[in-house]
C-alpha cells in the first residue's frame, strides 16, 4: 500500500512580514497530480480558501491584495490528488507590521562602539507592550524576540551585545507587539546604525559559544547574547 502523499511546501512572496496595506501572495506547491489546493488558517473556519492549480498543476496561488490584521496568522496548505488529500504543509506565519505606533531604538552607551567592548540596544515604546523584536536589515531570518514572563507589560527591552565584533555593525530596527497576537507588530522604529571601530578582532564568534553574537554580515539570524536583559523579559529565538 502506498504511503501518505508528500506534504506540500508553503511560502509567501515577497516574504512573510508584510506592511499594512501591501499585497502578499501565498504559494502552495504540491505535485503534478494535484487537482485542488486548500489553505487553512489557524483559528479560522476551514478551508480558509481553495484554489485550482496553476499549470502545470504543481502549485496554487492565494492572493491577498491588501494586508490587514485579519490576514495575519498561521497557515497550512494541502492538495488533493486522485488518491486523496496530502499531509499538511509546514506552517507559514504571516506577520503584519503597522499595527501599533513605532518604538524608539537607541544604543547605550553609544552607537559608535569599539570592537571587544559592549553595547546595549534599547527598544522603547510609548505604551506598555509585552514583546519586543530586534532586526538587522537584510537578514534572512530577521527576528529576535524578547517576551515578558507573565504577560507583564513593559515600556522597553534591552538587547545586550558583548563582546562586539565587526559582525555586529549594520542597521538595526525594532518592533513592539502585544502577546495576544504575535502576528501583529508595530511600525518599525527609525533605523539605528551601529558602527564598530577598532581592531580588537578575534576569530568570528560562533553561535554555539556560551556568549553568542548578533547577525552575521547579511544572512545570519540575530542570536541572543548570554546575559539576561534587565527588563525582566525573557528571550525567545523563533
Amino acid at each position: 500500500q502506498a504511503g501518505p502523499l508528500p506534504k506540500p511546501t508553503l511560502w509567501a512572496e515577497p516574504g512573510s512580514v508584510i506592511s499594512w496595506g501591501n499585497s502578499v501572495t501565498i504559494w502552495c506547491q504540491g505535485t503534478l497530480e494535484a487537482r485542488e489546493y486548500r489553505l487553512d488558517k489557524e483559528e479560522s473556519p476551514a478551508p480558509w480558501d481553495r484554489q485550482n492549480p496553476l499549470e502545470p498543476k504543481n502549485k496554487a496561488r492565494f492572493s491577498i491584495p491588501s494586508m490587514t490584521e485579519d490576514y495575519a496568522g498561521r497557515y497550512r496548505c494541502y492538495y488533493r490528488s486522485p488518491v486523496g488529500w496530502s499531509q499538511p504543509s509546514d506552517p507559514l506565519e504571516l506577520v503584519m507590521t503597522g499595527a501599533y505606533s513605532k518604538p524608539t531604538l537607541s544604543a547605550l552607551p553609544s552607537p559608535l562602539v569599539t570592537s571587544g567592548k559592549s553595547v546595549t540596544l534599547l527598544c522603547q515604546s510609548r505604551s506598555p507592550m509585552d514583546t519586543f523584536l530586534l532586526i538587522k536589515e537584510r537578514a534572512a531570518h530577521p527576528l529576535l524576540h524578547l517576551r515578558s514572563e507573565h504577560g507583564a507589560q513593559q515600556h522597553q527591552a534591552e538587547f545586550p551585545m558583548s563582546p562586539v565584533t565587526s559582525v555586529h555593525g549594520g542597521t538595526y530596527r525594532c518592533f513592539s507587539s502585544h502577546g495576544f497576537s504575535h502576528y501583529l507588530l508595530s511600525h518599525p522604529s527609525d533605523p539605528l546604525e551601529l558602527i564598530v571601530s577598532g581592531s580588537l578582532e578575534g576569530p568570528r564568534p560562533s553561535p554555539t559559544r556560551s556568549v553568542s553574537t548578533a547577525a552575521g554580515p547579511e544572512d545570519q539570524p540575530l542570536m541572543p547574547t548570554g546575559s539576561v536583559p534587565h527588563s525582566g523579559l525573557r528571550r525567545h529565538w523563533e
Epitope: 496595506g21 499585497s23 501572495t25 506547491q29 537584510r138 542597521t171 518599525p188 522604529s189 554580515p217
Partner: antibody
Framework: QVQLQEAGPGLVNPSKTLSLTCTVS????????WSWIRQPPGKGLEWIGY???????NYNPSLQSRVTISVDMSKNHFSLKLSSVTAADTAVYYC?????????????????WGQGTTVTVSS | DIQMTQSPSSLSASAGDRVTITCRAS??????LAWYQQKPGKVPKLLMY???ALQSGVPSRFSGSGSGTDFTLTISSLQPEDVATYYC?????????FGQGTKVEIK
C-alpha cells in the same frame, strides 16, 4: 560578503539541455530567493525563475515547460536546466539573490549578482 | 501576468540635467519595485528597492517614487558615469517581470 559564480558550458547544441550552476560563497543559501536571469545579445533582461529554500520554485511562464531550477544545500549552489534549446536561448545567463527583509517593512531587490556566463546555442 | 512598461526607451540629456524614467505596471504591485543600472558590458546593479529606498552605496542623486502602478526613477543631476541602461522590475509575486529598459546617453 556574499559572492555568486556561474559555471557551465559556453556552447550547447540545439535541442539539447543547457545546464548551469551558481555557487554561493560567503553566506548561506537558505532562506533567500535565488534567481536566474538572462540577457540575449543587445536585448533586455529576462527573468527565468527562482528557487526558495529547499525547493519552492516559480518560473517565467514563457519558459516554464522547459525550465528546472534546483538547489544543493550541501554544496551551497543552485542550478538551472533549460531543455530543447534553440538559437533564441543564446544569452548571457546571470544568477542573483533577492535581498532579505528590511525593517522599514520592505524587501530588497536583487542585490547580489554573478558575473554572468555567455551561452551560445549552435551546432 | 502583470506587464511592466518603461518610458522612454531611450533619452539623451546634458550633464547636470534632471532625468526622469517612468515604469508602469499593468496591475498594482504595492511598492515592490526595484530599479537596476546596467553599464555596457557590465553586470546589472541594484539602485533602488521598494520603489523609493536607495540601495547602500548608490549616490543620492538617484531617487525613486511611486506605489501601485506608476513609478519613477529620477537622476537629479546627470553625470557622465550615469550613461547606462536602466531597468525596472517587479517582485511582488512571480513572475518577476522586468521593464524593457531605458537607455540613457549624454548629449
Amino acid at each position: 560578503q556574499v559572492q555568486l559564480q556561474e559555471a557551465g558550458p559556453g556552447l550547447v547544441n540545439p535541442s539539447k539541455t543547457l545546464s548551469l550552476t551558481c555557487t554561493v560563497s560567503g553566506g548561506s543559501i537558505s532562506s533567500y530567493f535565488w534567481s536566474w536571469i538572462r540577457q540575449p545579445p543587445g536585448k533586455g533582461l529576462e527573468w527565468i525563475g527562482y528557487i526558495y529554500n529547499s525547493g519552492s520554485t516559480n518560473y517565467n511562464p514563457s519558459l516554464q515547460s522547459r525550465v528546472t531550477i534546483s538547489v544543493d544545500m550541501s554544496k551551497n549552489h543552485f542550478s538551472l536546466k533549460l531543455s530543447s534549446v534553440t538559437a533564441a536561448d543564446t544569452a548571457v545567463y546571470y544568477c542573483a539573490r533577492r535581498g532579505g527583509y528590511y525593517g522599514s517593512g520592505n524587501y530588497g531587490g536583487m542585490d547580489v549578482w554573478g558575473q554572468g556566463t555567455t551561452v551560445t546555442v549552435s551546432s | 501576468d502583470i506587464q511592466m512598461t518603461q518610458s522612454p526607451s531611450s533619452l539623451s540629456a546634458s550633464a547636470g540635467d534632471r532625468v526622469t524614467i517612468t515604469c508602469r505596471a499593468s496591475q498594482g504591485i504595492s511598492n515592490y519595485l526595484a530599479w537596476y543600472q546596467q553599464k555596457p558590458g557590465k553586470v546589472p546593479k541594484l539602485l533602488m528597492y521598494a520603489a523609493s529606498a536607495l540601495q547602500s552605496g548608490v549616490p543620492s542623486r538617484f531617487s525613486g517614487s511611486g506605489s501601485g502602478t506608476d513609478f519613477t526613477l529620477t537622476i537629479s543631476s546627470l553625470q557622465p558615469e550615469d550613461v547606462a541602461t536602466y531597468y525596472c522590475q517587479k517582485y511582488d509575486s512571480a513572475p518577476w517581470t522586468f521593464g524593457q529598459g531605458t537607455k540613457v546617453e549624454i548629449k
